[in-house]
C-alpha cells in the first residue's frame, strides 16, 4: 500500500514537472523524455488499479485543526482582535471567492498562485488570494471613502508550501486597514504600532520591523538606470536579499533578468544598507537620490514616520531596510515586514525558520482600479501571518510540554451513588441556565473515580457531587480537583460559589 501511495505521488510530481517544462517552453527532447518517464510510472501503477482504495487525507497544503490546535488558535486570535478593537476598528466579511476579473492584474508575478474555480454557469471565479483586494473592491462597490476595519478569514494560494514552517495553501490572514484621506504618516505609524503591540503581546520572541517605501525603491531604480518595464521584476529579485546573498541576487538580475552588471552594482550599493532615521537623513543628502522627486517624497515621509514611531515608543523595533521590496504590485508608499530575530527555541536547538510574521504597507491606487472614474481612496494596512505564529506557539508549547485546556468547562456534575441520573440532569440544567459551563458523564451510574479522572484529563477545576445525604440536607459537595478539598455548599449558593471560584462575573450581562 505504501509503495502504491509513493508511486501515485511520483506520478503526480512527474505530471507537475512535465507541465512546468511545457510552460517554460523547455527543449522538445527534454519534454519528450520526461513524458516518457511519466508514462512508465503510470504503467507501473497498473491499468485498473487507479480505482484502488481511496486514501483519506486532506488536500496538499491544508490541514485539520485538532482541539488543542484550535485552543492555541483562539488564544492568538483573541490577542489580535482585542488589539484591533482597542484601535477602534470595525469588522467586515467578504465572499471566499471573487470574480476572477476582480483579482486579475493586482498581484504581479504572484498571479500564477491564484486558484481558479471550475466554471459554475457563466461567472469566472477565483478563490481570494488575500483580504486586501476584496477590501478595495468592497470600498469601491459601496462608494466608501473612509473606514477603519479588520477582517480575519482564510485565503488561498497555489503555493508549494513548506508546511513544517507554517506555510499552507489555505491559511488565515488577519488584516487591519485604514482607508481615507488623512495627514501623512499618522495612520501608517498606527499600523506599525498595532503590529508591534500584537507581536509583543503574543510573546513569540524578539522581532524587528523592516520599513521601506515603494517610491524610494522606484526612485533608486530610476537613478541606477533600470528601465520602467523592469522595475517590478527587479523588485522581486531585491526582495530575496533576506534569504540569499547579494551575489546570488545580482546573478539573477544580470543572468535571468537582463540587467547590465554596472546597473546591478549601483543597486547593490543602496539595497545593502539598513539603519534608522540617520540612514533616512543620510539618503536625503545623497546627491543622486535627493534629485529624484519620488525618492525625495518617500524619504520625507519616512523621516516623519520615524518621528511618530518615536512618540509611539516603538522606534527601537523599526529598521529602515532598502532591500525590502514586498512582492505585491499594489503598494505605492511605505511598506513594512516584521521578522522574528530568533524564536524561543530551547538552548542548543535550531531556531524555527518561519520568516516574516506580519507585513503591510500603503496602497493608494488599489481602490481606484475598481472605480469607473478612477477615484482614489488612500489606504494603509497590515496583515498578521497567523499560521506562522500558530506554528511557533504550538512548537513552543510542545517543547515546554505545557498542557493546554481544550474546553472551558468549570464544573462536572457528578454523583457518588447509583440512581442519581435525574438529579444530575436537574442540577446541570440549573447550572447551564445560570451561565455556568458545566458537563456530566453520559452514563446512568458512573463510578466516582471515573468522573474525577475525567476532570483531571480535561482540566476541569471543580466537581459538584450529589449524594443521597446531600440531597436530604439540601447541599452539594463542591470538590476542587487539584487540591481535593471538599466543602458542602447550599444548593441555592452553588452558582455564586462556582462563579467566585472560577473568577467569572456574577451577572451574565
Amino acid at each position: 500500500m505504501a509503495e502504491r501511495a509513493a508511486l501515485e505521488e511520483l506520478v503526480k510530481l512527474q505530471g507537475e514537472r512535465v507541465r512546468g517544462l511545457k510552460q517554460q517552453k523547455a527543449s522538445a527532447e527534454l519534454i519528450e523524455e520526461e513524458v516518457a518517464k511519466l508514462l512508465k510510472l503510470k504503467a507501473q501503477l497498473g491499468p485498473d488499479e487507479s480505482k484502488q482504495k481511496f486514501v483519506l487525507k486532506t488536500p496538499k497544503g491544508t490541514r485539520d485543526y485538532s482541539p488543542r490546535q484550535m485552543a492555541v488558535r483562539e488564544k492568538v486570535f483573541d490577542v489580535i482582535i482585542r488589539c484591533f478593537k482597542r484601535h477602534g476598528a470595525e469588522v467586515i466579511d467578504t465572499p471566499v471567492f471573487e470574480l476572477k476579473e476582480t483579482l486579475m492584474g493586482k498581484y504581479g508575478e504572484d498571479s500564477k498562485l491564484i486558484y481558479d474555480l471550475k466554471d459554475q454557469g457563466g461567472e469566472l471565479l477565483s478563490l481570494r488570494y488575500d483580504l486586501t483586494v476584496p477590501f478595495a473592491r468592497y470600498l469601491a462597490m459601496n462608494k466608501l471613502t473612509n473606514i477603519k476595519r479588520y477582517h480575519i478569514a482564510k485565503v488561498y494560494r497555489r503555493d508549494n508550501p513548506a508546511m513544517t514552517r507554517g506555510r499552507y495553501r489555505e491559511f488565515y490572514q488577519c488584516d487591519f486597514d485604514i482607508a481615507g484621506n488623512f495627514d501623512p504618516m499618522i495612520p501608517d505609524a498606527e499600523c506599525l504600532k498595532i503590529m508591534c503591540e500584537i507581536l509583543s503581546s503574543l510573546q513569540i520572541g524578539d522581532f524587528l520591523v523592516k520599513v521601506n517605501d515603494r517610491r524610494i525603491l522606484d526612485g533608486m531604480f530610476a537613478i541606477c538606470g533600470v528601465s520602467d518595464s523592469k522595475f517590478r521584476t527587479i523588485c522581486s529579485s531585491v526582495d530575496k536579499l533576506d534569504k540569499v546573498s547579494w551575489e546570488e541576487v545580482k546573478n539573477e538580475m544580470v543572468g535571468e533578468k537582463g540587467l547590465a552588471p554596472e546597473v546591478a552594482d549601483r543597486i547593490g550599493d543602496y539595497v545593502q544598507q539598513h539603519g534608522g532615521v540617520s540612514l533616512v537623513e543620510q539618503l536625503l543628502q545623497d546627491p543622486k537620490l535627493s534629485q529624484n522627486k519620488q525618492a525625495l517624497e518617500g524619504l520625507g515621509d519616512l523621516k516623519l514616520l520615524f518621528e511618530y514611531l518615536t512618540l509611539f515608543g516603538i522606534d527601537d523595533k523599526i529598521s529602515f531596510d532598502l532591500s525590502l521590496a514586498r512582492g505585491l504590485d499594489y503598494y505605492t508608499g511605505v511598506i513594512y515586514e516584521a521578522v522574528l530575530l530568533q524564536t524561543p527555541a530551547q538552548a542548543g536547538e535550531e531556531p524555527l525558520g518561519v520568516g516574516s510574521v506580519a507585513a503591510g504597507g500603503r496602497y493608494d491606487g488599489l481602490v481606484g482600479m475598481f472605480d469607473p472614474k478612477g477615484r482614489k481612496v488612500p489606504c494603509v494596512g497590515l496583515s498578521i501571518g497567523v499560521e506562522r505564529i500558530f506554528s511557533i506557539v504550538e512548537q513552543r508549547l510542545e517543547a515546554l510540554e505545557e498542557k493546554i485546556r481544550t474546553t472551558e468547562t468549570q464544573v462536572l456534575v457528578a454523583s457518588a451513588q447509583k440512581k442519581l441520573l435525574e438529579e444530575r440532569l436537574k442540577l446541570v440544567s440549573e447550572l447551564w441556565d445560570a451561565g455556568i459551563k458545566a458537563e456530566l458523564l453520559y452514563k446512568k451510574n458512573p463510578k466516582l473515580l471515573n468522573q474525577l479522572q475525567y476532570c483531571e484529563e480535561a482540566g476541569i477545576p471543580l466537581v459538584a457531587i450529589i449524594g443521597e445525604q446531600e440531597l436530604k440536607d439540601g447541599v452539594i459537595k463542591l470538590r476542587s480537583v487539584t487540591s481535593r478539598e471538599e466543602v458542602d455548599v447550599r444548593r441555592e449558593d452553588l452558582v455564586e460559589e462556582i462563579k467566585r471560584r472560577t473568577g467569572q462575573p456574577l451577572c451574565i450581562c
Epitope: A6, L10, E33
Partner: antibody, heavy 120, light 107 residues
Framework: QVQLVESGGGLVKPGGSLRLSCAAS????????MSWIRQAPGKGLEWVSY????????KYTDKVRGRFTISRDNAKNSLYLQMNSLRAEDTAVYYC?????????????WGQGTLVTVSS | DIQMTQSPSSVSASVGDRVTITCRAS??????LAWFQQKPGKAPKLLIF???NLESGVPSRFSGSGSGTDFTLTISSLQPEDFATYYC?????????FGQGTKLEIK
C-alpha cells in the same frame, strides 16, 4: 535480490583510458534507467552520467562531457562507462546505480564500487 | 546547477537522541529530494525519497519532511548502527547534485 557488480577500475596515467563495466542481476535490467555516480577519496558524491532504458537518452556532467561515454547492452544485462583523456581529478570510486521506480533519478540500488586512480 | 547545502556538516550525539539534519536547495525543487546513509568503505543506501517516503526496509525512526527549498531528515531515537554520513540529493534536474554530507558521530 538486486545485485550490481562493477569492474574495470585500476591505475591509469593522465590522458589514458579505462572502460568500466557493471553486471546487473535480480531485476529486469531493460526496464531501468541506469547511472554512474562517483566519489573522490574522502569527498562527497557526484552524479556523472545516466542512460535511459532503451539508450535513447544519455546525459553527462560538464566535467566529463566529451571524454566519457555511457552505454548499455540489455541482452547482457550490462552497463558500461568508457573513460578517455583521464585527469587526476577523475580519481574516485565509481558506482553503478539503478534508478528508483525505473525512471526516478534517485539511486535505490548501488554496486560496491570500483576504484579508478589517475596518476603519473 | 542546483546547489545543495547540508547543515550541520558534522554532529555528535548519543544513542537514544533525536537528531535533525537539514538540506537547503539553491532553488525550488518541489519534493524531488532523497536522503542516503553511507558507512565507511560502503556504497550509499537510500533512506528517504521524494522528501518524505521511507524506502522499504528502512526503520521508521527515520523520517523526512520539507518541500521547495528546505528539507529535514530526522532520526527520532539514534541506534548504534545509525552513526554514518548522510547525504541529501536533488532529483529535480540534471546534473543531479548531492549535499556535501553530514557526519553523525558518537558523542
Amino acid at each position: 535480490q538486486v545485485q550490481l557488480v562493477e569492474s574495470g577500475g585500476g591505475l591509469v596515467k593522465p590522458g589514458g583510458s579505462l572502460r568500466l563495466s557493471c553486471a546487473a542481476s535480480g531485476f529486469t535490467f531493460s526496464d531501468y534507467y541506469m547511472s554512474w555516480i562517483r566519489q573522490a577519496p574522502g569527498k562527497g558524491l557526484e552524479w556523472v552520467s545516466y542512460i535511459s532504458d532503451s539508450s535513447r537518452y544519455t546525459k553527462y556532467t560538464d566535467k566529463v562531457r566529451g571524454r566519457f561515454t555511457i552505454s548499455r547492452d540489455n541482452a547482457k544485462n550490462s552497463l558500461y562507462l568508457q573513460m578517455n583523456s583521464l585527469r587526476a581529478e577523475d580519481t574516485a570510486v565509481y558506482y553503478c546505480a539503478r534508478y528508483l521506480y525505473q525512471v526516478i533519478a534517485i539511486a535505490d540500488a548501488w554496486g560496491q564500487g570500483t576504484l579508478v586512480t589517475v596518476s603519473s | 546547477d542546483i546547489q545543495m547545502t547540508q547543515s550541520p556538516s558534522s554532529v555528535s550525539a548519543s544513542v537514544g537522541d533525536r537528531v535533525t539534519i537539514t538540506c537547503r536547495a539553491s532553488q525550488g525543487i518541489s519534493s524531488w529530494l532523497a536522503w542516503f546513509q553511507q558507512k565507511p568503505g560502503k556504497a550509499p543506501k537510500l533512506l528517504i525519497f521524494v522528501a518524505s517516503n521511507l524506502e522499504s526496509g528502512v526503520p521508521s525512526r527515520f523520517s523526512g519532511s520539507g518541500s521547495g527549498t528546505d528539507f529535514t531528515l530526522t532520526i527520532s531515537s539514534l541506534q548504534p548502527e545509525d552513526f554514518a554520513t548522510y547525504y541529501c540529493q536533488q532529483a529535480e534536474s540534471f546534473p543531479y547534485t548531492f549535499g556535501q554530507g553530514t557526519k553523525l558521530e558518537i558523542k
